[in-house]
Each structure stands twice: as C-alpha cells, then as structure tokens.
Interface confidence: low
C-alpha cells in the first residue's frame, strides 16, 4: 500500500528536444575504481533465470559448507536456510562450523506476502568464483519461512547487496559487501550481467545453463558493448536512481517526471519484473497496447496473470514496442536512456498444455512502492554498482536477447532540465519501506 500524502506534482519537465545532444565533457571515460579488464575467474559465476532469481555459489563456515545464494540488490541481509525445508536440498548447519559465532539476537523479515525469520550470527564466508578472500560476515540463519524459498529455484539463501539502512533488524547489522570491503582490499564496487535465456528453461537446463556474471571489485569489458553511462545513486539505502523521462517506441509518456519516481525508483536484481507506479503503469500499458494493436490480448495478459502463446518460432516481436527509460546523468542537465526490447519484458514460461508453443508472461506490473527495475530490465544491460563513487553504470549487455532488427541500447547524452525535481521526497513515515 502507499503511505502518506502525495506531494504536489510539477506540471511539466523542461526537456530540450531529443535531437539536441550535449557535448561530452571529455573524450576519455573517467577512470573506474577497482581493477578493470578481465575477471576470468568470476565470469559466468551466476546461474538461474529471471522468474526465480540468479544465484552465486558461496561457502560458509569451517569446514566450508557450499550453498547457492540469490543475488539481491534490493535488500541488505545475508540470510541462509539453516533448518530443513521441503524446497531446500541443503542448508547451513551452524553446529558443524567451528568458526560460527552466535549473536544471540533474532531477526524477522515480513514481506507483503510471506516472511522469513531466523537467528543472527557471524561466520567465515567466501565466494569460490569470486575474489580469493575470506571474510567474517553477519549471517541470518533462517529457521522459519513462509513463501520465501522457491521450489526448484536451486538457491538456499539470499545475499542482500544494498546498504545498511535497510538491513534487518536494523542498520547496525553490517551487510556482507560492507564487511568484504572493510576486511579486504576488494574495491567498493561490483557489477552484474544477468543473462535471460529468451526461452523457457526446464530444471536440468537451468542447472546446466550459464545465468551471467557477478564481478566483485571491478568491471569486465568482455561483458558489454559500447560505453558505460552512469546515473547517480540518489540515496544509499536501496540502489535508488532518478528516472526523468519514459518513452514507448519513441513516444514520450508525457507525465510529470515525479510520477516515475513515486515514491522511489530502485535497481533490484531480486525482483523479476519492471514494476511501475500505478499511474505510470496504466499509461505505459495503454501505450504498449496501442503500439501492438494488430493483435488483441486478454486483459489478464496485461495484468501478468495470463500467458500468451504463439506457435514455436513465430513470436511477433516486431509488433511490440521498445521501452526507453531516461536516467539522470552525472553532468548537470544531462541524461541518458536505456532501451529494452519485448524480448526483455515478455518473459518466456513453460506451458505444459501447449509445449509446442512459445508462451510468455507480460513482465511489467503495477507497484505501490515506486519503480523497480528488476531482472527484466537488468537482463538487457551490464550494470555497474559503483558504490565508491555513488553511481550506477549501464551498458548494453553482451548476452542480452534480441533479434536481427533491434537491440537493447544505452544512449546519450540528452539535455534534460530540472531533473532534481523528478525525485520524490518520501513523506516521512516509518512504514514507507515496511512492506517491500
């Protein structure tokens, strides 16, 4: 639910014509923090798919216990299954770890639907296909959960990569990445390449397939094409950014830009869909419907409840529009745009009844907690979480799904005025982030 009163919205955004480009401040890209170039040991260290999350292999305890851990930029706890559960193949057994330390404190995390709760402790943690370091990190040992673990997802825990402000039970619990940076020489930066398959994967295919890469401490040039464009992190809690304009097939939605960020806009690898505030969602769906009007789809499709299927290999990608989100740039009055294809926002799903067909779910949905740029957005791009410089970078992913006519894009710069006014100032109520 939405909380608090709505702030008065500005009637318009002073945007210059899109043809007007700002000159680059320099021909050189500013030097990135951390190591650049090749991170061979970390490439292809993720598996999974957008509907069930992407996970990385981690080890916990002494001797090391191997677990698959969901990579989640929308939360800040490192939490692992620590008791038997019907959906878990394995779980963290604290009693078997000589380095486990009990913090004698509980943690409870309810979601709009579902919850998990557990006991806090610390232990030694490492990432086999990551930096060659071991850190002592806070761990929430999940002892009870409801609608949290996903049957068949193959992950047993969650790695919250956002900031301490949203850690549970409170911001005194240091998140894993903070511990990693503090205790080692790993630069304060990570990057994600999530690779959507473009077709449904059965269980054995998911286990065998490559899901992408989490590069810890740097940027790997082999994972993207073109340039990286950066948007400021507005506030260090979630990875909050500011969207300044939205276009469907090049047509501006023409909404007050505050609406796009009502009540925040975040980059969240732990969410499947592109989630949009109610008003924006309605306008976007109306525009997508109009653009794809050569075919009719049931209302349930647009609500994400019904599948739409085509005979194998005949999906009419060309009737669906591209979607562009303009993000605040690093330079005053400068923005850039990221453009996704229907191959990102139509999510392939298995439909047992019609296995000869290609079936899809509409992966844009309505939100009451702001815009969430989930996996369907991230699957188009290589995304750099440059915590050191408080910014997020986007470049076209080398693994994004496209066709011979269109490709995802990251382009700029564009002149956009008064971008600061696009940020929504959340009315100060404690519960504004309560039901994420």
């Amino acid at each position: 639910t939405q909380h608090g009163i709505r702030l008065p919205l500005r009637s318009g955004l002073g945007g210059a014509p899109l043809g007007l480009r700002l000159p680059r401040e320099t021909d050189e890209e500013p030097e990135e923090p951390g190591r650049r170039g090749s991170f061979v040991e970390m490439v292809d260290n993720l598996r999974g798919k957008s509907g069930q999350g992407y996970y990385v292999e981690m080890t916990v305890g002494s001797p090391p216990q191997t677990l698959n851990i969901l990579v989640d930029t929308g939360s800040s706890n490192f939490a692992v299954g620590a008791a038997p559960h019907p959906f878990l193949h394995r779980y963290y057994q604290r009693q078997l770890s000589s380095t486990y330390r009990d913090l004698r404190k509980g943690v409870y995390v309810p979601y709009t639907q579902g919850k998990w709760e557990g006991e806090l402790g610390t232990d030694l943690v490492s990432i086999p296909h990551g930096p060659n370091v071991t850190v002592r990190a806070n761990i929430a040992a999940i002892t009870e959960s409801d609608k949290f673990f996903i049957n068949g997802s193959n992950w047993e825990g969650i790695l919250g990569l956002a900031y301490a402000e949203i850690a549970r039970p409170d911001d005194s619990l240091e998140p894993f990445f903070d511990s990693l940076v503090k205790q080692t020489h790993v630069p304060n930066l990570f990057s994600l390449q999530l690779c959507g398959a473009g077709f449904p994967l059965n269980q054995s295919e998911v286990l065998a397939s490559v899901g992408g890469s989490m590069i810890i401490g740097g940027i790997d040039h082999s994972l993207y094409t073109g340039s990286l464009w950066y948007t400021p992190i507005r506030r260090e809690w979630y990875y909050e950014v500011i969207i300044v304009r939205v276009e469907i097939n090049g047509q501006d939605l023409k909404m007050d830009c505050k609406e796009y960020n009502y009540d925040k806009s975040i980059v969240d690898s732990g969410t499947t869909n592109l989630r949009l505030p109610k008003k924006v969602f309605e306008a976007a769906v109306k525009s997508i419907k109009a653009a794809s009007s050569t075919e009719k789809f049931p209302d349930g499709f647009w609500l994400g409840e019904q599948l739409v299927c085509w005979q194998a290999g005949t999906t009419p990608w060309n009737i669906f529009p591209v979607i562009s989100l303009y993000l605040m740039g690093e330079v005053t009055n400068q923005s850039f745009r990221i453009t996704i294809l229907p191959q990102q926002y139509l999510r392939p799903v298995e439909d047992v009844a019609t296995s000869q067909d290609d079936c899809y779910k509409f992966a844009i949905s309505q939100s009451s907690t702001g815009t969430v740029m989930g996996a369907v957005i991230m699957e188009g791009f290589y995304v750099v979480f440059d915590r050191a410089r408080k910014r997020i970078g986007f470049a076209v992913s080398a693994c994004h799904v496209h066709d011979e006519f269109r490709t995802a894009a990251v382009e700029g710069p564009f002149v956009t005025l008064d971008m600061e006014d696009c940020g929504y100032n959340i009315p100060q109520t404690d519960e504004s982030t309560l039901m994420t």
Partner: antibody, heavy 119, light 107 residues
Framework: QVQLVQSGAEVKKPGASVKVSCKAS????????MHWVRQAPGQGLEWMGS????????NYAQKFQGRVTMTRDTSISTAYMELSRLRSDDTAVYYC????????????WGQGTTVTVSS | DIQMTQSPSSLSASVGDRVTITCRAS??????LNWYQQKPGKAPKLLIY???SLQSGVPSRFSGSGSGTDFTLTISSLQPEDFATYYC?????????FGGGTKVEIK
C-alpha cells in the same frame, strides 16, 4: 547506554504553548525516527506524530494538525515537540520514543514530561 | 484510521497463571503489531514487535501470535513483576493507533 532524556514538567495556562525537548544519547540520532506519544491521566496511549531527524520531515496525527510542530537540532541530538493553543484536556504525560525505519516498535522511550494546563 | 480493540480491559490473575490478552484490528494489518507493557508512573516498554518477535531482553514467558486482524499476547506463567497495563499498537499506517489497554491486576 542508549537513552532519551526529556525536559522537566511544565504548568501552562489555556491558550499558551509548550515546547518539550528530548535529548538522545548512546546512538546515532539521525538513524532513527522520533515519535511523540501522550497519555492523559488514567487514560491510554495516544500517538501524536513523528519526525525524521535526518531530513526534518514530519508526520502528524490529524487530531493535532495545525497545533503541533516537531523539530530537531542534529548538532545536539535533540528533538522537540511544541503544542500550541493549549486546552485543559492537553494535560498529559508526553513521551518521545525512537523507531527505526523498518523496525516495528518504539524500542526506547523518554521518561516522560508532565504538562499541566490549568487556569 | 485503523482502530485497535483490546480485550479484556482488565483482568485479575495469580502468580503462575497463564494469561492471554487479545487485540483486534479494524482491518487487516498482516503481522504489523507491537505489544507494550507499562507500569504506573513509567514509560511503556516494547515487548513484542511484528506480532511474534520478542524484543531483546524480554523474558521468554511473553509470546505473541496472530496475523491479519486478530492477535494475542500470552504470558505463560505470570510473575509478580508482570502486573501492569499492556497495550497493542499497529505500526502499519498513520496515524499509529494503540489499543485501549488491558490492566493485569493481582487476584
């Protein structure tokens, strides 16, 4: 240790204003919301509003809108609650209590400030 | 506004008794419920948050349960120091609302 220390008791005439202070210590003042709750003699607890010490943003109960002002001074880790146009039924003990974002309870309370409104 | 209704408003019990206090919300509040204990002349003290999570330092004889609209605070074995007034409160939406309180007295 973590504590909230409130200003002393006040006696006010109807129509006057009162300003109660709440000094935080033992934790990062800007990391927690501050709420104000009052309790009339022999009655239950009544929520008045909250302030985000970081931004200064406030949220007031409808009942007190226009009469209450919550402020803070981060340099001295102190929150203030001012209630104007006092009436006799404003006689109560006023408490400040801290609440974390994403925490569910008011986990630390001030000792309370008794405000008596009498002509 | 979400109304919180507590029952009973008062009860008499003896040391060692199992005591149950209920709280009903006027609309579903999921698990967003807190319980507080208040002794005369003192500030309230947080016992339970999120319906069932025990606040640090609170004895394990206190427990909370429920979700949606109906919630329960249970004291498994009443101790002399537990005689006090207990309040429920919802932190889900503004205005924050408290129940009317339940006074637990010595029989």
């Amino acid at each position: 240790q973590v504590q909230l220390v409130q200003s002393g008791a006040e006696v006010k005439k109807p129509g006057a204003s009162v300003k109660v202070s709440c000094k935080a210590s033992g934790y990062t003042f800007t990391g927690y919301y501050m709420h104000w709750v009052r309790q009339a003699p022999g009655q239950g607890l009544e929520w008045m509003g909250s302030i985000n010490p970081n931004s200064g943003g406030t949220n007031y109960a409808q009942k007190f809108q226009g009469r209450v002002t919550m402020t803070r001074d981060t340099s001295i880790s102190t929150a203030y609650m001012e209630l104007s146009r006092l009436r006799s039924d404003d006689t109560a003990v006023y408490y400040c209590a801290r609440v974390r974002v994403r925490h569910y309870g008011m986990d630390v309370w001030g000792q309370g400030t008794t405000v008596t409104v009498s002509s | 506004d979400i109304q919180m209704t507590q029952s009973p408003s008062s009860l008499s019990a003896s040391v060692g008794d199992r005591v149950t206090i209920t709280c009903r919300a006027s609309q579903s509040i999921s698990s967003y419920l807190n319980w507080y204990q208040q002794k005369p002349g003192k500030a309230p003290k947080l016992l339970i948050y999120a319906a069932s999570s025990l606040q640090s330092g609170v004895p394990s004889r206190f427990s909370g349960s429920g979700s949606g609209t109906d919630f329960t605070l249970t004291i498994s074995s009443l101790q002399p120091e537990d005689f006090a007034t207990y309040y429920c409160q919802q932190p889900l939406s503004h205005p924050r609302t408290f129940g009317g309180g339940t006074k637990v007295e010595i029989k």
